[in-house]
């Protein structure tokens, strides 16, 4: 009997998507490339449930982890790598006092119990996201 695996080996399934939490570190741009190489995208967050799930994964492992959010195109205008803007209800996830753009901090990371902006050239862990395979039929 063939079992259906909605996600590749070492990926985590959550609400119809597959997530890969890296075990190595890269800068923000290279993290984007790493996700593209496996047919995925540096994680773009669409719901509060998804945010809570990812924040928990990141804080559990006590890692600073890149997400697909930056204000590289226009300072102060935060945009996801899929081109969509940071929506009002997601701004609550910034840690207190963030984003503060201290010394050109233009890329967003999971940090502790919320988000932080940091320098994009720093090496950090990253999370990729792609749609899960359909197991119907």
């Amino acid at each position: 009997e063939r079992l259906c695996h909605p996600c590749p080996w070492e990926w985590t399934f959550f609400q119809g998507n597959c997530y890969f939490m890296s075990n190595s570190q890269r800068n923000w741009h290279d993290s984007i490339t790493a996700c593209q190489e496996v047919g995925a995208q540096l994680v773009v967050i669409k719901s509060a449930e998804e945010q809570n799930f990812l924040q928990l994964q990141s804080s559990r492992s006590n890692r600073f982890t890149w997400m697909g959010l930056s204000d590289l195109n226009h300072e102060g205008t935060w945009q996801w790598v899929d081109g969509s803007p940071l929506l009002p209800s997601f701004k609550q996830y910034w840690n207190k006092g963030e984003p503060n753009n201290v010394g050109e901090e233009d890329c967003a990371e999971f940090s502790g119990n919320g988000w932080n902006d940091d320098k994009c050239n720093l090496a950090k862990f990253w999370i990729c996201k792609k749609s899960a395979a359909s197991c119907s039929g």
Epitope: Q15, G16, N17, V44, K46, S47, A48, E50, T77, W80, D82, G83, S84, P85, L87, P88, S89, K91, Q92, S131
Partner: antibody
Framework: QVTLRESGPALVKPTQTLTLTCTFS??????????VSWIRQPPGKALEWLAL???????YYSTSLKTRLTISKDTSKNQVVLTMTNMDPVDTATYYC???????????WGQGTMVTVSS | QSVLTQPPSVSGAPGQRVTISCTGS?????????VHWYQQLPGTAPKLLIY???NRPSGVPDRFSGSKSGTSASLAITGLQAEDEADYYC???????????FGGGTKLTVLG
């Protein structure tokens, strides 16, 4: 109790600029998580989202109308203003302002103001 | 043509159950964005009926329920009453359009 009220001209001529004001009470647009949006509804047709401004003064616009719209707020007066340039008869609609709190639901609406575009 | 597709009309007799579907795509409902539902009684402004897929604001009867799966969502109304006759709209966010979007609306007629 949250209330919103729209005001503006009932009739505008083609090519003119429409200015609508939303006056609200029961919440503050300086409170984190609060936003105010403009939504319109042509007679007998569906709702169409136009623009939104949040407590942070970040502005969001409908892609198809972006070049014609400007949204702004006056926190001290509890008002949000929408301007729409180059009005056309197809812009005839009831214009609503609505509050959006967290999770992107429009949880309180004004009664709407009907705007007719005609020469 | 609305980004979220709803049936133009549905009908049912008092006491019956009706459902209204809202079909989207991978850039809105299927992407994981929340779905909300509004009721618009004739000649009045819309009113929030269901928020975040399945939650009822206080004051909304438990005859109204919402669900979401994949790229679609649905609103169910049980024990239909004459006062439920109204237009119903679904709403979500669309990342391709970078904006909030509504369905085309569904007119509910309560028969008899």
């Amino acid at each position: 109790q949250v209330t919103l009220r729209e005001s503006g001209p009932a009739l505008v001529k083609p090519t003119q600029t429409l200015t609508l004001t939303c006056t609200f009470s029961g919440f503050s647009l300086s409170t984190s998580g609060m936003s105010v949006s403009w939504i319109r509804q042509p007679p007998g047709k569906a709702l169409e989202w136009l623009a939104l401004i949040d407590w942070d003064d970040d502005k969001y616009y409908s892609t198809s109308l972006k070049t014609r719209l400007t949204i702004s707020k006056d926190t001290s007066k509890n008002q949000v203003v929408l301007t729409m340039t180059n009005m056309d008869p197809v812009d005839t609609a009831t214009y609503y302002c609505a509050r959006m709190a967290l999770r992107h639901a429009f949880d309180a609406w004004g009664q709407g103001t009907m705007v007719t575009v005609s020469s | 043509q609305s980004v979220l597709t709803q049936p133009p009309s549905v009908s049912g007799a008092p006491g019956q159950r009706v459902t209204i579907s809202c079909t989207g795509s991978s850039s809105n409902i299927g992407a994981g964005y929340d779905v909300h539902w509004y009721q618009q009684l004739p000649g009045t402004a819309p009113k929030l009926l269901i928020y975040v897929n399945s939650n009822r604001p206080s004051g909304v009867p438990d005859r109204f329920s919402g669900s979401k799966s994949g790229t679609s969502a649905s609103l169910a109304i049980t024990g239909l009453q004459a006062e439920d006759e109204a237009d119903y709209y679904c709403q979500s966010y669309d990342s391709s359009l970078s904006g909030w979007v509504f369905g085309g609306g569904t007119k509910l007629t309560v028969l008899g």
